[in-house]
Interface confidence: low
C-alpha cells in the first residue's frame, strides 16, 4: 500500500466564488474516496466534479475532486480522503 499525497488549492471563479480543488496523487491501490465536506457533511455528487483515477506512470494513481464555494466560507469546507483503511481531512488554504 502506498498512501496518497493530498494537496488542496483554490482559484478564482466567478465574482464572489472560488473553486477549490483537492488532488490525491502517488497512491496504490487505486480504490480511494475523495470528497468535499461542508460543516463535516459530504457535499452531494452534483455539486462536485471528479477526475478519473488515472495511472501516473510510476505504478501509482492520481485523481482530484473540485467544487465551487462562496468566498469567505472557506473554513466550512474540508476535503476528506480515505484510502486502504486510513483517512485524513484537509482544509482549504487561506
Amino acid at each position: 500500500t502506498v498512501p496518497p499525497m493530498v494537496n488542496v488549492t483554490r482559484s478564482e471563479a466567478s465574482e464572489g466564488n472560488i473553486t477549490v480543488t483537492c488532488r490525491a496523487s502517488s497512491f496504490y491501490p487505486r480504490n480511494i474516496i475523495l470528497t468535499w465536506r461542508q460543516d463535516g457533511a459530504s457535499l452531494s455528487h452534483d455539486t462536485q466534479q471528479w477526475g478519473d483515477v488515472l495511472p501516473d506512470g510510476n505504478g501509482t494513481y492520481q485523481t482530484w475532486v473540485a467544487t465551487r464555494i462562496c468566498r469567505g466560507e472557506e473554513q466550512r469546507f474540508t476535503c476528506y480522503m480515505e484510502h486502504s483503511g486510513n483517512h485524513s481531512t484537509h482544509p482549504v488554504p487561506s
Epitope: D39, A41, T47, H90
Partner: antibody
Framework: QGQMQQSGAELVKPGASVKLSCKTS????????ISWLKQKPGQSLEWIAW????????SYNQKFTAKAQLTVDTSSSTAYMQFSSLTTEDSAIYYC???????????????WGQGTLVTVSA | DVLMTQTPLSLPVSLGDQASLSCRSS???????????LEWYLQKPGQSPKLLIY???NRFSGVPDRFSGSGSGTDFTLKISRVEAEDLGVYYC?????????FGGGTKVEIK
C-alpha cells in the same frame, strides 16, 4: 474512540467570563470537528458551535455568537470555549463532543466529554 | 430554526415491553447532500448523552439491535423492541441537517 476530559466545575459571578477546556487523547486531534453543547438542569440540549481542529474554523449557533468563543491548542490536543458576560441564564452543564465522520457516513456527537457544571451566582 | 417536537413527554413501560418514541420536525430535514441527519441519544441521570442512532436508522457501534430508527421527511420513530433496565432515561432526537442544529425536548422512559 479516544477520550475527552473536561475541566472541573466553575462558580462565577455575573458579568464575569469563564474558559472551559476539553482535553482529548486517543485520536488524531487535527482531523476532527468538536462541538460544544449546553444543558440547563432538567432541560434539553442546545448546540452552541463547532470548531474544526485542523484550522480553527468555526460555525456558531447565532444565539451564541456574542457569548461563546471557541479555540483549539493543537500542541496539547485541547479545545476551549470562553463564555463571556455571564448571567444566571448561563448556569448549565457544558459538554464537548466529537463528530464522527468515517467514509461517507456521519454522526454529529459520537463521543462526549463528562461535562462541566458552570454556576453563575452573586 | 428547526423545531423538534418529541412525544410523549413521559413513557411508562414494563421491562420486556416494546417502546415507541416519536419525533417530528417543523420542516423537512433532508440535507442538501441528500442525507437526513436525524439522530437519537439516550441520557441517563448524571451522565453525558450517548449516541444510539444516526442518519435515521443506522445503529452506532456497540448499540444493541433492540434499538431501531425509522422515518423520513418530518416524522421519525425510535423503537425499543424489549426494554431493559439499562434503557431507562431520557431520549433526545436531534437534527444536524440545518444550522443551527437542534434537539427535541426529550422523552423520559421510566418503569410503569
Amino acid at each position: 474512540q479516544g477520550q475527552m476530559q473536561q475541566s472541573g466545575a466553575e462558580l462565577v459571578k455575573p458579568g464575569a467570563s469563564v474558559k472551559l477546556s476539553c482535553k482529548t487523547s486517543g485520536f488524531t486531534f487535527s482531523d476532527n470537528y468538536i462541538s460544544w453543547l449546553k444543558q440547563k438542569p432538567g432541560q434539553s440540549l442546545e448546540w452552541i458551535a463547532w470548531i474544526y481542529a485542523g484550522t480553527g474554523g468555526t460555525s456558531y449557533n447565532q444565539k451564541f455568537t456574542a457569548k461563546a468563543q471557541l479555540t483549539v491548542d493543537t500542541s496539547s490536543s485541547t479545545a476551549y470555549m470562553q463564555f463571556s458576560s455571564l448571567t444566571t441564564e448561563d448556569s448549565a452543564i457544558y459538554y464537548c463532543a466529537r463528530h464522527d465522520y468515517y467514509g461517507t457516513s456521519g454522526a454529529w456527537f459520537a463521543y462526549w466529554g463528562q461535562g462541566t457544571l458552570v454556576t453563575v451566582s452573586a | 430554526d428547526v423545531l423538534m417536537t418529541q412525544t410523549p413527554l413521559s413513557l411508562p413501560v414494563s421491562l420486556g415491553d416494546q417502546a415507541s418514541l416519536s419525533c417530528r420536525s417543523s420542516q423537512n430535514i433532508v440535507h442538501i447532500n441528500g442525507n437526513t441527519y436525524l439522530e437519537w441519544y439516550l441520557q441517563k441521570p448524571g451522565q453525558s448523552p450517548k449516541l444510539l442512532i444516526y442518519k435515521v436508522s443506522n445503529r452506532f457501534s456497540g448499540v444493541p439491535d433492540r434499538f431501531s430508527g425509522s422515518g423520513s421527511g418530518t416524522d421519525f420513530t425510535l423503537k425499543i423492541s424489549r426494554v431493559e433496565a439499562e434503557d431507562l432515561g431520557v431520549y433526545y432526537c436531534f437534527q444536524g441537517s440545518h444550522v443551527p442544529w437542534t434537539f427535541g425536548g426529550g422523552t423520559k422512559v421510566e418503569i410503569k
